[in-house]
């Protein structure tokens, strides 16, 4: 560290040879004592700092700040200034040192450029070749060729300073291929290096002004501005900022060259412009110059000053965004600030995170939408100085065209008996919910097939007309149509009912949901037959593994012969477009079965009993009946569906919660098997038993805590069971606040 | 609106001298090069002389080097052509100009008639 | 120097017509080339800067292409306004030199 004098006024380093000029002869020793009143240094020509092994720098063994500077058997190249220095100032003392070698007149500079001099045709401008000497009283000369011509001094615009080298006017060499100095002693001539003359250029290829897209600041911050030219070879080039407040100081622009790859066919310069710093005055566009003589070129950037540092949300930020299911949906931050905050996203109060589906940051980004990224997004901005934060909520919907539930389950082949009433039902469920549901009919005779593949459990028909079912006329009687709401696994869905008064003739219905983002549609083939009638025992749809049966019973004084059988595969359609009407033509290939034989006061009733039931049982039933009189087949169709076990699986994860006393918990836990499983809570590992605080509902499902107490904050456990196992979902309610004590207590 | 403004032309003797000026308003003047370029009656256009923002870099024509001179007063927005030394064939219309990528601004021409 | 070699010297042409004028330079100067316009007692008008850059406000009719030593001026449709003499000039090397000129008269 320096250490001064104190109560000592700075004085100059003082050097042990009180003259500026110093001459000595090659191979002598040149020795040199610098004494100051701080820590000192020496440079030396060349500008080698301590980095040359013939030089030695030693500390004096009399004083604390002195330091001797000795050469050994000095050369010509030596010649130059030694500078004696503070290290922390400017304060200096020099003595300029002559070695002087009459062998080598001229010494090598580090600014030589390895030989290069640059001139311009500026008439005025003189140029300096430096051709240095280690003895100040040469007579030297300037030679140019080709061709060739000698220049001497002529005490006016041509001169030699052993210091510099020799100085001309640029004009004058111009034409030159190259130069060196020369000089005469004692009837011999001594040469300098040769200097290879290169006329400057002057095309501009291109000036950038960085940063480029504009700079923000607050008052009082510093401004720093590059503004880079990009030039050919040989270019010297005036640089010139233009801004209003720039007329006034204080600014500070350094311009320098910048060192480029060797070989490089361009030179670059730099222009720095510096504000220490600013005040709003100095808002505006800033316009950087480049000039070379025949080429100008500009660039400019734009600098916005700041009262202070702050963060806002700019106008357009979006509150709701609706989007359809599939959609990419781009959700901008439109933020004011400076600095530029950071920026986080929240769903339902957890922080986001980007995947592969899903990108935060100035953007919100949803490459496709699907329901569950329907929620209340939360963006915060935070100034990264201040940390003021500033939030925004962002109502995402994602819209869902309308879905009709039983399209893929039910069967479109199965009969209705004839006189009976029968209700057709649509589940719909859209986001919107559906504006409209409407019901439309046509005769079963009055449509075609449709051929699609894709038809096949869905909407094996097409018709020409559909007519609404209010015009009946034909038809079955109807006797209404209503739509409820209804929450179905966990959905708010829309069942819309269609009830036929009495089946009197085959017919297709369809139902029609509209929402905004789309319609779906179902249709229902309602086959009506006068011949025996299917139930399935117990009625619910069977598991694999259960005991089902398949009943089919007819009136014994009308029919006989009651028959079993399965539908073979290849009379099932391949194509929807082969899908028979009516149902009992063309069954093809049909595998009987066995069958039990009941009878009641009026009925006979044939049963096919499946005691285990597998998912090879699945398929088309067919009751067949004979007419007693006509011995006309009558036949009815059945679709058995068996449900494949599965062991229960959490489908919705329960979430933590932080809670504050007296409010109310409400969580579900949402769980899938088959069959389906019993629902147990737990708390801490103790399972839970309803009391006026904790209710249990939905068979157990939910669980809701009302009134909430501190007690009440621990791990809570949803146990989902079935023969097959059971599955277990966790979350921990947090209980904040201090709990108040009742009179009760 | 960008404009250069000429002035200083006239008849001169051969030997004689003669200080083209050039006035700049519309734009920063002190950013651009500038130029000069002539043109003898009936002829083709001759390159003359350049002078960069600062004056630092400064080019002639081989057939005026030495004789003229341009200089510039950036504090005054002007360019000035000094002809010494004039010759029959410098008589023609001088031009100032403005340069950037090209010679995108002209100024107006002023004729310079050398002639005993 | 660079040698600037216009053709042709001279054109006729009537409104409406497709003109083409060319530069030839003595050895090659990239695509630093440059094509201005002058009326009689005016002065020139820059119109195509690095042989094919359109200056502000020039009609698009004016184009430039071409590069080495080889380029061409094209009008597409001439118009009244159109009759003038054409130079090119090289910015290659120092010094600049302009071509020669080309003088567009009527028909």
């Known amino acids: 560290a320096s250490v001064g004098l104190p109560g000592v006024s700075l004085e100059s380093p003082t050097l042990s040879t009180q003259k500026d000029i110093l001459t000595i002869m090659a191979n002598s020793t040149l020795q040199i004592t610098c004494r100051g009143q701080r820590e000192l240094d020496w440079l030396w020509p060349n500008h080698q700092s301590g980095s040359e092994e013939r030089v030695e720098v030693t500390e004096c063994s009399d004083d604390l700040f002195c330091k001797t500077l000795t050469i050994a058997k000095v050369i010509a190249n030596d010649t130059g200034a030694y500078k004696c220095f503070y290290q922390d100032t400017n304060m200096a003392s020099v003595v300029y040192v002559y070695v002087q070698d009459y062998r080598s007149p001229f010494i090598a500079s580090v600014s030589d450029q390895h030989g290069v001099v640059f001139i311009t045709e500026n008439k005025n401008k003189t140029m300096v070749i430096p051709c240095l000497g280690s003895t100040s009283n040469l007579n030297v000369s300037l030679c140019a060729r080709y061709p060739e011509k000698r220049f001497v001094p002529d005490g006016d615009k041509i001169s030699w300073d052993s210091k510099k080298g020799f100085s001309i006017p640029s004009y004058m060499i111009s034409y030159a291929g190259m130069v060196f100095c020369e000089a005469k002693i004692h009837d011999e001539t001594y040469q300098s290096i040769m200097y290879i003359v290169v006329v400057v250029g002057y095309r501009i290829y291109d000036v950038l002004v960085s940063p480029p897209h504009g700079v923000e600041l607050s008052v009082g911050q510093k401004l720093v501005l590059n503004c880079t030219a990009r030039t050919e070879l040989n270019v010297g080039l005036d640089f010139n900022w233009e801004h209003p407040s720039l007329k006034h100081p204080p600014k500070k622009v350094v311009n320098r060259e910048l060192k480029t790859q060797p070989g490089s066919e361009m030179k670059k310069f730099l222009s720095t412009l510096t504000i220490e710093s600013v005040t709003r005055a100095d808002q505006g566009w800033y316009i950087c110059a480049a000039s070379s003589g025949l080429m100008t070129k500009r660039n400019s950037t734009f600098v916005r000053v700041h009262e202070k540092p702050f963060v806002a949300f700019g106008s357009g930020m979006e509150s709701l965004v609706e989007a359809a299911v599939g959609a990419r949906i781009r959700v901008p931050v439109r933020w004011l600030g400076y600095p530029p905050p950071e920026i986080k996203w929240y769903k339902n109060g957890r922080l986001l995170e980007s995947n592969h589906t899903i990108k935060v940051g100035h953007v919100l980004t949803i490459s496709e939408a699907s329901e569950k990224d329907t929620g209340n997004y939360t963006v915060i901005l935070t100034n990264p100085i201040t940390r003021e934060k500033q939030s925004h909520v962002v109502s995402l919907v994602v819209n869902v065209p309308p879905q009709i539930g039983e399209k893929s389950l039910i069967s479109p082949v199965d009969s209705y008996q004839y006189g009976s009433s029968q209700t057709l039902t649509c589940t719909v469920y859209a986001v919107p919910p559906p504006h409209h549901i409407r019901w439309y009919w046509q005769l079963e005779e009055e449509c075609s097939e449709q051929a699609s593949q894709s038809a096949l459990m869905t909407n094996p028909y097409t018709c020409k007309e559909w007519r609404n079912v209010e015009d009946f006329q034909g038809g079955n009687r109807i006797e209404g149509s209503k739509n409820q709401f209804a929450l179905i696994e966990g959905k708010n869905k829309t069942v819309s009912t269609l009830v036929i008064q009495a089946a009197n003739v085959s017919a297709l219905y369809k139902c029609e949901a509209v929402n905004s983002v789309g319609r779906g549609e179902r249709i229902i083939s309602f086959h009506v037959t006068r011949g025996p009638e299917i139930t399935l025992h117990p009625s619910t749809q069977p598991t694999e593994q259960e005991t089902v049966s398949l009943w089919c019973s007819a009136d014994r004084t009308t029919f006989e012969n009651l028959t079993w059988c399965k539908l073979g595969p290849q009379a099932l359609p391949v194509h929807a477009g082969e899908l028979p009407v009516p149902v009992c033509e063309n069954l093809g290939a049909l595998a009987r079965l066995n069958a039990t034989v009941f009878s009641n006061s009026t009925n006979d009733i044939l049963i096919t009993e499946f005691q285990n039931a597998s998912l090879q049982d699945q398929g088309h039933y067919v009751c067949f009946a004979q007419d007693k009189k006509t011995k006309k087949r009558h036949c009815v169709v059945r679709q058995l569906v068996v449900l494949e076990r599965m062991a229960p699986v959490i489908t919705g994860s329960l979430e933590n919660q932080t809670t504050s006393i007296g409010e109310t918990i409400e969580v579900s836990c949402m769980a899938s098997g088959n069959p389906p499983p019993q629902f147990t809570w737990f708390k801490d590992n103790e399972m839970l038993v309803e009391d006026s605080g904790i209710i249990l509902k939905a068979g157990n499902q939910n669980l809701t805590i009302r009134r909430v107490r501190k007690e009440d904050e621990g791990l809570y456990t949803c146990q989902a069971c079935s023969v097959l196992g059971c599955v277990r979902a966790e979350a921990f309610f947090i209980v904040e606040g201090a709990q108040e004590k009742t009179n009760l207590e | 609106e960008v404009q250069l403004v000429q002035s200083g032309g006239g008849l001169v003797k051969p030997g004689g001298s003669l200080r083209l000026s050039c006035a700049a308003s519309?734009?920063?003047?002190?950013?651009?090069?500038m130029l000069w370029v002539r043109q003898a009656p009936g002829k083709g256009l001759e390159w003359v002389s350049a002078?960069?923002?600062?004056?630092?870099?400064?080019y002639y024509a081989d057939s005026v080097k030495g004789r003229f001179t341009i200089s510039r007063d950036n504090a005054k927005n002007s360019l000035y052509l000094q002809m010494n030394s004039l010759r029959a064939e410098d008589t023609a219309v001088y031009y100032c100009?403005?340069?950037?990528?090209?010679?995108?601004?002209w100024g107006q021409g002023t004729l310079v008639t050398v002639s005993s | 120097d660079i040698q600037m070699t216009q053709s042709p010297s001279s054109v006729s042409a009537s409104v409406g017509d497709r003109v083409t004028i060319t530069c030839r330079a003595s050895?090659?100067?990239?695509?630093?080339l440059t094509w201005y316009q002058q009326k009689p007692g005016k002065a020139p008008k820059l119109l195509i800067y690095?042989?094919?850059s359109l200056q502000s406000g020039v009609p698009s009719r004016f184009s430039g292409s071409g590069s080495g030593t080889d380029f061409t001026l094209t009008i597409s449709s001439l118009q009244p306004e159109d009759f003038a003499t054409y130079y090119c000039?090289?910015?290659?090397?120092?010094?600049?030199?302009f071509g020669g000129g080309t003088k567009v008269d009527i028909k």
């Open positions: 519309g734009f920063t003047f002190s950013s651009y090069s």
């Open positions: 002078i960069s923002s600062s004056s630092s870099y400064i």
């Open positions: 050895r090659g100067i990239d695509n630093w």
């Open positions: 000039q090289q910015a290659k090397a120092f010094p600049p030199t």
């Open positions: 690095e042989a094919s």
């Open positions: 100009a403005r340069v950037t990528d090209a010679f995108d601004i």
